[in-house]
């Protein structure tokens, strides 16, 4: 049999080989498609199937506007002028070229050594589903599950039967200072159909920078707490990957496991003092927060001491 592809919505003509070009003709078309239950027989006389498929005067079969339900097998059996039976057999597939794919929510820049979402490539309205591929500097990017991760999603429109594809790319760039170019392409996987490409996006890769700011948050606000109360100190830092955080009290390191949160339950006067946190980033060394003062006193005795936490709850230096 012969494989035929037709664009959804366009007419398709299948010839009945051996059929005389003009009536009288002895021919029969049989089709087994998404519209039929098993085989449907069409005769040149026409009928209610004319809108879906009709036999032309020369014996060919016309599908005026092919659809997904027309995918299937079409067979014609004709008797030629010499009385010999000739058979034609077609396997029909339909396709729809989607709109140009787009990269949505693209990153503005990437950070070396950490996972970065590059963006999501979206293709809408394809049939068959097809595939999305990512390219780095013009070369096909093969997901390895470690440095290059691709998360894919395919949805089918309930009415049209067309597909929407989404592909989210996450990468871990090895070094900073580079400017990689990413693009995405859609391929239907049909012969003679070129892939559709997105506009490329060029991104700067920066080294994981020193944390932009390190803030020490204290609860209760002001750092004044009644005996037996609880104090929570949180070291807030905007760095990727999250650095190790150690704690200092009155200039001496506290012998605690690294943690961005320091909890002081049932405080007593021995917990009073000046606290700060130190964040250690592998490539940038340690960075210390401004200190905060913790005072244990009966409530209402005194206002915030100099160098303690102000209204905002952020550590401030006197």
């Amino acid at each position: 049999g012969q494989n035929i592809t037709a664009r959804i919505g366009e007419p398709l003509v299948l010839s009945c080989k051996g059929a005389p070009k003009k009536p009288p003709q002895q021919l029969e078309w049989k089709l087994n498609t998404g519209r039929t239950e098993a085989w449907k027989v069409l005769s040149p006389q026409g009928g209610p199937w004319d809108s879906v498929a009709r036999i032309l005067p020369n014996g060919s079969l016309l599908l005026p506007a092919t659809g997904i339900v027309d995918e299937g097998t079409f067979r014609c059996r004709a008797t030629n002028r010499r009385g010999k039976e000739v058979k034609s057999n077609y396997r029909v597939r339909v396709y729809q070229i989607p709109g140009k794919p787009e990269i949505v929510d693209p990153a503005s820049e990437l950070t070396a050594s950490v996972p970065n979402k590059v963006g999501t490539c979206v293709s809408e309205g394809s049939y068959p589903a097809g595939t999305l591929s990512w390219h780095l500097d013009g070369k096909l990017l093969i997901p390895d599950g470690k440095e290059t991760l691709v998360k894919e999603e395919t949805r089918r429109h309930p009415e049209t039967g067309l597909f929407t594809l989404r592909s989210e790319l996450t990468v871990i760039p090895t070094q900073g200072g580079t400017h990689p170019t990413f693009s995405c392409s859609f391929s239907l996987g049909l012969p003679r159909r070129r892939p559709l490409n997105t506009a490329p996006i060029q991104l700067r890769v920066r080294e994981p920078g020193p944390p932009e700011g390190i803030q020490l948050l204290v609860e209760p606000e002001g750092g004044i707490v009644a005996p037996g109360g609880t104090v929570t100190l949180t070291c807030a830092i905007s760095a990727q990957p999250p650095p190790q955080v150690h704690w200092i009290k009155d200039g001496a390191p506290l012998p605690l496991a690294p943690s961005p949160v320091l909890l002081l339950p049932e405080v007593g006067h021995e917990d009073e003092g000046t606290y700060s946190c130190v964040a250690t980033h592998p490539s940038h060394g340690p960075q210390e927060s401004p200190p905060v003062s913790i005072r244990v006193t009966e409530t209402g005795d005194e206002g915030p001491a100099e160098g303690s936490v102000g209204e905002s709850g952020l550590g401030t230096l006197a």
Epitope: I8, E10, S15, A65, I68, V69, Y127, T160
Partner: antibody
Framework: DVQLQESGPDLVKPSQSLSLTCTVT?????????WHWIRQFPGNKLEWMGY???????NYNPSLKSRISITRDTSKNQFFLQLNSVTTEDTATYYC????????WGQGTLVTVSA | DIVLTQSPASLAVSLGQRATISCRAS??????????MHWYQQKPGQPPKLLIY???NLESGVPARFSGSGSGTDFTLNIHPVEEEDAATYYC????????FGGGTKLEIK
């Protein structure tokens, strides 16, 4: 017998959207064929604009793709044309037609784009 | 896009004579099974009317003096014998990869 009838405003201001309706009688637009919009400019040049298939999928003329949308209301057996950001160049007679062979056309409606 | 070039742009033919209109496609509009070329007639104030579909098939109700031929990129519409009512503009149109129309040929009857 199959009949198509275009309707919509005959005057549209530049930069606005042109919206037309094609009402089909004598055949269900979900039963088969593709349903097209075609326009004819004052110099008689014909331009195919796009179609909506009986399944609901659409195809558009690449030159209009960024501005055009064809939709339908199956309960009313109507399909619609929306053309955005029109200019005086979009002044034309707009036809709807049944595709596959274009054996059936509406009578056409003249739309003038003018301030 | 496939571009269709019609020739001549206009022609005048005497009553009863043959009118021949050509349409050339920038790329083949045919397959091994058929040619996706159609011909229309348009009179002032009316929509185009289908005459010939798929290169050579006469639309129902169209007089047999109209005939179409051709394959691949070259197609012809013939009208013979020409009658008074055939004065109109004729267009070719393909449906191979989306759709385009030719520029039209205006037929005058002498």
């Amino acid at each position: 017998d199959v009949q198509l009838q275009e309707s919509g405003p005959d005057l549209v201001k530049p930069s606005q959207s042109l919206s037309l309706t094609c009402t089909v009688t004598g055949y269900s637009i979900t039963s088969g064929y593709s349903w097209h919009w075609i326009r004819q400019f004052p110099g008689n040049k014909l331009e195919w604009m796009g179609y909506i298939h009986y399944s609901g999928s659409t195809n558009y003329n690449p030159s209009l793709k960024s501005r055009i949308s064809i939709t339908r209301d199956t309960s009313k057996n109507q399909f619609f044309l929306q053309l955005n950001s029109v200019t005086t160049e979009d002044t034309a007679t707009y036809y709807c037609a049944r595709g596959g062979d274009f054996a059936y056309w509406g009578q056409g409606t003249l739309v003038t784009v003018s301030a | 896009d496939i571009v269709l070039t019609q020739s001549p742009a206009s022609l005048a033919v005497s009553l009863g004579q043959r009118a021949t209109i050509s349409c050339r496609a920038s790329k083949s509009v045919g397959t091994s099974d058929s040619s996706y070329m159609h011909w229309y007639q348009q009179k002032p104030g009316q929509p185009p009317k289908l005459l010939i579909y798929l290169a050579s098939n006469l639309e129902s109700g169209v007089p047999a003096r109209f005939s179409g031929s051709g394959s691949g990129t070259d197609f012809t519409l013939n009208i013979h014998p020409v009658e008074e009512e055939d004065a109109a503009t004729y267009y070719c149109q393909h449906s191979r990869e989306l759709y385009t129309f030719g520029g039209g040929t205006k037929l005058e009857i002498k």
